[in-house]
Interface confidence: low
């Protein structure tokens, strides 16, 4: 039968099995989430988008899932990132008491996956899904990340860290998930400060990227929200990771 053609790639192959398997794996490794019933998690996930028009998904659709996946991060342990996911994840793999959204259950379930359904059928669309730019922004994947990112930011406390990509023309991009969602949902009564780590790409790049206009813009937004702002240049990301692993290494006493 006829199926709507969207501009984006279709649901990831074996999506239900992947989500369920990831959930089981996560709850096995994280004892504080052992109470989670993965079948209920999948049912709630499915319920958010199955048989719904995939350009009309709301944050409300994901609330049952968000409720099941409730998790807290200790104060000072939240790591946000923008356009530099791999390094952020490498960092939390080594500094294993800090957490990105993808280290939490819901972020872990959905990381790198695509999904969507169709209006009035119980089928998953493996052929195509709406593209954020070409089709619509209220699609299942975009709304999911907006929902869980908002929640992740809302629950952060203490000093929050964010890793930013110094190689991009807009180091801080107001249109990114960090710039459009997370920044505005940090709670001033719980968050004392936001510390930005600007990751340099070039070997010989010794500029102070904390003086970049977009970083100044971020500082302004954060300061207006009554949250202090700090910024650090990470000139050598490779050395940075090595020094996280071994802070006593003599070479780590010099700048990174």
């Amino acid at each position: 039968r006829w199926r709507q053609q969207w501009s984006g790639s279709g649901t990831t192959s074996r999506f239900p099995e992947t989500v369920l398997a990831r959930c089981v794996k996560y709850t096995e490794v994280h004892p504080e989430m052992r109470h989670v019933d993965c079948q209920s998690v999948w049912d709630a996930f499915k319920g958010a988008f199955i048989s719904k028009y995939p350009c009309n998904i709301t944050e409300e659709d994901y609330q049952p899932l968000v409720k099941l996946g409730t998790q807290t991060v200790p104060c000072n342990k939240t790591l946000l990132w923008s356009r530099i996911k791999d390094l952020a994840h490498q960092f939390t793999q080594v500094q294993r008491d800090m957490f990105t959204l993808e280290d939490m259950l819901l972020g872990y379930l959905a990381d790198d996956l695509t999904w969507c359904g169709e209006f009035n059928t119980f089928e998953i669309n493996y052929q195509s899904c709406p593209d954020w730019r070409k089709d619509c922004s209220n699609n299942p994947v975009s709304v999911f990340w907006k929902t869980v990112s908002r929640r992740f930011a809302e629950t952060a406390c203490g000093v929050v860290h964010v890793m930013l990509n110094g190689s991009r023309s807009k180091i801080f991009d107001k249109n990114s998930t960090f710039g459009s969602v997370e920044v505005h949902n940090l709670q001033p009564e719980k968050v004392q400060a936001l510390e930005a780590w600007v990751i340099h790409g070039g070997r010989e790049d010794s500029r102070d990227l904390c003086q970049d206009p977009t970083i100044k813009e971020l500082e302004s937004i954060i300061s207006k929200r009554n949250i202090r702002f700090f910024c650090k240049n990470i000139y050598r990301p490779d050395k940075f990771l090595q020094c996280v692993k071994n802070p006593e290494d003599s070479s780590c006493l010099s700048g990174i």
Epitope: E28, P31, E32, P74, D86, V94, D97, K245
Partner: antibody, heavy 120, light 111 residues
């Protein structure tokens, strides 16, 4: 400083159960997983599992699931391991161990060990 | 389960010499560019003591003569020069996957 002090040696009969303790001090007991490791004569060290005292959540090595039970008393900052249906191959030294931090799964702090001898 | 095979089982050396202990995993223990392999020293009647974590990082208070290297499935603990107090049993341990597993141990004895 972090200290883990374990209960004394036990001699038990086959088929019986044994419950040993590990009293923690020098840190916030509810914030760190407490692991248990088995050292049997002539065998490699075996990881049994761990408990998160903050909410009682556990994670067991499949091999020990069902016979080992991990519990914690947060008011006494003490973790417990009970092993049921004991057999001769359970004769071993059992260590409690704490990792360096949440999700840092290498063992920075160890108890002195509890020797369990299964003998009729 | 990931099986860790240590070699040699016994190593006989004299103080001042270099000890090299190998640990081979049945599958890669790398994740995000790090080897999730750790090394411990154990002396009779004592619990193990952490020496090296994440393949190559020395634990707090461990002398510089202990070093770790390797990635993927092959890891090495090197002690040089050997001191009299270094004669003990050494274990590798992985935490890439549950269940976390240990190697069979290498006994380092005085020649």
């Amino acid at each position: 400083q972090v200290q883990l002090v374990q209960s004394g040696a036990e001699v038990v009969k086959p088929g019986a159960s044994v419950k040993m303790s590990c009293k923690a001090s020098g840190y916030t007991f509810t914030s760190f997983n407490m692991h248990w490791v088995k050292e049997a004569p002539g065998q490699r060290l075996e990881w049994i599992g761990y408990i998160y005292p903050g909410n009682g959540g556990t994670n067991y090595n499949q091999k020990f699931q069902g016979r080992a039970t991990l519990t914690a008393d947060t008011s006494a900052s003490t973790a417990y391991m009970e092993i049921s249906s004991l057999r001769s191959e359970d004769t071993a030294v059992y260590f409690c161990a704490r990792t360096g931090g949440l999700r840092r799964a290498y063992f920075t702090y160890w108890g002195q060990g509890t020797l369990v001898t299964v003998s009729s | 389960d990931i099986v860790l095979t240590q070699s040699p089982a016994t190593l006989s050396l004299s103080p001042g010499e270099r000890a090299t202990i190998s640990c081979r995993a049945s599958e890669s223990v790398d994740s995000y560019g790090n080897g999730f392999m750790h090394w411990y020293q154990q002396k009779p009647g004592q619990p193990p003591r952490l020496l090296i974590y994440l393949a190559s990082s020395r634990a707090t208070g461990i002398p510089a003569r202990f070093s770790g290297s390797g990635s993927g499935t092959d890891f090495t603990l090197t002690i040089s020069p050997l001191e009299p107090e270094d004669f003990a049993v050494y274990y590798c341990q992985q935490n890439k996957e549950d269940p976390w597993t240990f190697g069979g141990g290498t006994k380092l004895e005085i020649k």
